[in-house]
């Protein structure tokens, strides 16, 4: 049976290992893990340093302030910027919508409201824990970079997990594994000691003793409900058949635009409809 955390413990930012407790994920505090930790201490600095505060100040760039509307993602080009638009939007800045509330564009239980002006055919009001113009993005708790020593942060929905680089271990990759020193696993694999010998836990898309062999990510047909699997630089990507969403097309989309996501699917996080 699932653990019953302290009453009121934030399901997004807190978790428990014993009944009645409420332990906070990094970046959150308070008895119920509802208070964000102040970011004024420059936890994730980027850009040139400020002489007055010691904090790093971002340099200006064409994607600053994200010129892409409606949840479009901005990428810098040699001369300017380029917007990659979500489903149903197009135009230089993703400002043109070809979708209305009748198409059920709001995911994860988002409430669709018709737009007040011609440039926005609809607006999605997202439930807590989701964001984006279509409520397609789970709030990114990895942005505070909780994984140390270059570990890869994974937001599993019910908890954060760190995938550690070779030579490091622990919930936040805080432990240095001296036994694996000089025995690195290739392609982002993690070295694990066992019986005096080292073993590699390989990153997605790789296999073999030292993770040097490229695996076929689509071999096991991971995309459910007729989803089409493509090998991708990050492992694999699923193109979901209409009516399904999630990283592996595992979640049905209801006609009203909501999806049948379990409250906290074990080991999974509800993903973008196509990826």
């Amino acid at each position: 049976a699932p653990l019953v955390c302290r009453a009121g413990c934030s399901p997004e930012h807190g978790f428990c290992e014993q009944p009645g407790e409420c332990r906070c994920l990094e970046g959150w505090t308070g008895p119920l893990c509802t208070v964000p930790v102040s970011t004024s201490s420059c936890l994730s600095p980027r850009g040139p340093s400020s002489a007055t505060t010691g904090c790093l100040v971002p340099g200006p760039g064409p994607c600053d302030g994200n010129p892409c509307a409606n949840g479009g993602s901005c990428s810098e080009t040699p001369r300017s910027f380029e917007c990659t638009c979500p489903r149903g939007f197009y135009g230089l800045r993703c400002e043109v919508s070809g979708v209305t509330c009748a198409d059920g564009p709001c995911f994860n239980g988002g409430l669709c409201v018709g737009g007040a002006d011609p440039d926005s055919a609809y607006i999605c009001h997202c439930p807590p824990g989701f964001q984006g113009s279509n409520c397609e993005k789970r709030v990114d708790r990895c942005s505070l970079q909780p994984c140390r020593n270059g570990g890869l942060c994974l937001d599993l929905g019910h908890a954060l997990r760190c995938r550690c680089r070779a030579g490091f271990a622990g919930p936040r990759c805080e432990h240095d594994l001296d036994d694996c020193a000089g025995r690195a696993c290739a392609n982002g694999g993690t070295c694990v000691e066992g019986g005096g010998a080292h073993r590699c836990s390989c990153a997605l898309g790789f296999g073999g003793r030292d993770c040097r062999e490229r695996a076929d990510p689509c071999a096991a047909r991971p995309c459910a409900h007729g989803g089409r699997c493509y090998a991708h630089f990050s492992g694999l990507v699923c193109a979901c058949a209409p009516g399904y969403m999630g990283a592996r097309c595992e979640f049905p989309v209801h006609p009203d635009g909501a999806s049948a996501l379990p409250a906290a699917p074990p080991g999974l996080r509800p993903g973008d409809p196509q990826r």
Partner: antibody
């Protein structure tokens, strides 16, 4: 340099069979989404036939009209074949091999094509 | 599913603009899974536009795709002699299986 080359085309009699081969160079199918066949009758438009997963799953998709008479398969990490049976004069066409890639949440993007091989069905 | 292209042929002078329409009998996958190809005689097609409006690698910005759902347009501005070709739209669909269809093609004549 990434390339596709079709082979196996030629003259075949009605009700005959033929197997076309698509050979890739510069890349491996396993990292390339799907491999597909598209045909074009002389002076006519393009017609999608079938696709097969570049990986080991062997998943396939066929146009409704091609099911039964046409069969796509992957014979190695760089070759795909199209077996055609019960051929008729209407199957006379240039047959192209094309690579289908996933870009920005869209699929069936044929970003690499072979030069094509001509199949003529005639008695 | 049927993709209907109009008009064909279409002609314009060098430096001019042509617009090709592609009407789908049913909405394409994700409302934007439509591509445009250019084909010259004796050559295989070349991908110009994917995701209805995104320019493929190496394609000049004179080519512009737009539309969503069932109605799509390819606009070629500042026409050059080299743009003389046949242009095809291609839609992707799912109905108990994935499949793709091409429009009938539109020949562009540059005067």
């Amino acid at each position: 340099q990434e390339q596709l080359v079709e082979s196996g085309g030629g003259l075949v009699q009605p009700e005959g069979s033929l197997t076309l081969t698509c050979t890739a160079s510069g890349f491996s199918f396993s990292s390339s989404g799907y491999m597909c066949w598209v045909r074009q009758a002389p002076g006519k438009g393009l017609e999608w036939i079938a696709c097969i997963s570049g990986g080991s799953s062997g998943d396939t998709d066929y146009a409704n009209w091609a099911k039964g008479r046409f069969s796509i398969s992957k014979t190695s990490s760089t070759t795909v074949t199209l077996q055609m049976t019960s051929l008729t004069v209407a199957d006379t066409a240039t047959y192209f091999c094309a690579r289908d890639v996933y870009i920005d949440s869209t699929i069936f993007n044929f970003n690499l094509w072979g030069p094509g091989t001509l199949v003529t069905v005639s008695s | 599913q049927v993709l209907t292209q109009t008009p064909s042929p279409v002609s314009a002078a060098v430096g001019g603009t042509v617009t090709i329409s592609c009407q789908a009998s049913q909405s394409v996958y994700n409302n934007n899974n439509l591509a445009w190809y250019q084909q010259k005689p004796g050559q295989p097609p070349k991908l110009l536009i994917y995701a209805a409006s995104s320019l493929a690698s190496g394609v000049p910005s004179r080519f512009k795709g737009s539309g969503a759902g069932t109605q799509f347009t390819l606009t070629i501005s500042d026409l050059e002699c080299d743009d003389a070709a046949t242009y095809y739209c291609q839609g992707t669909y799912y109905s108990s299986g994935w499949y793709s269809t091409f429009g009938g093609g539109t020949e562009v004549v540059v005067k």
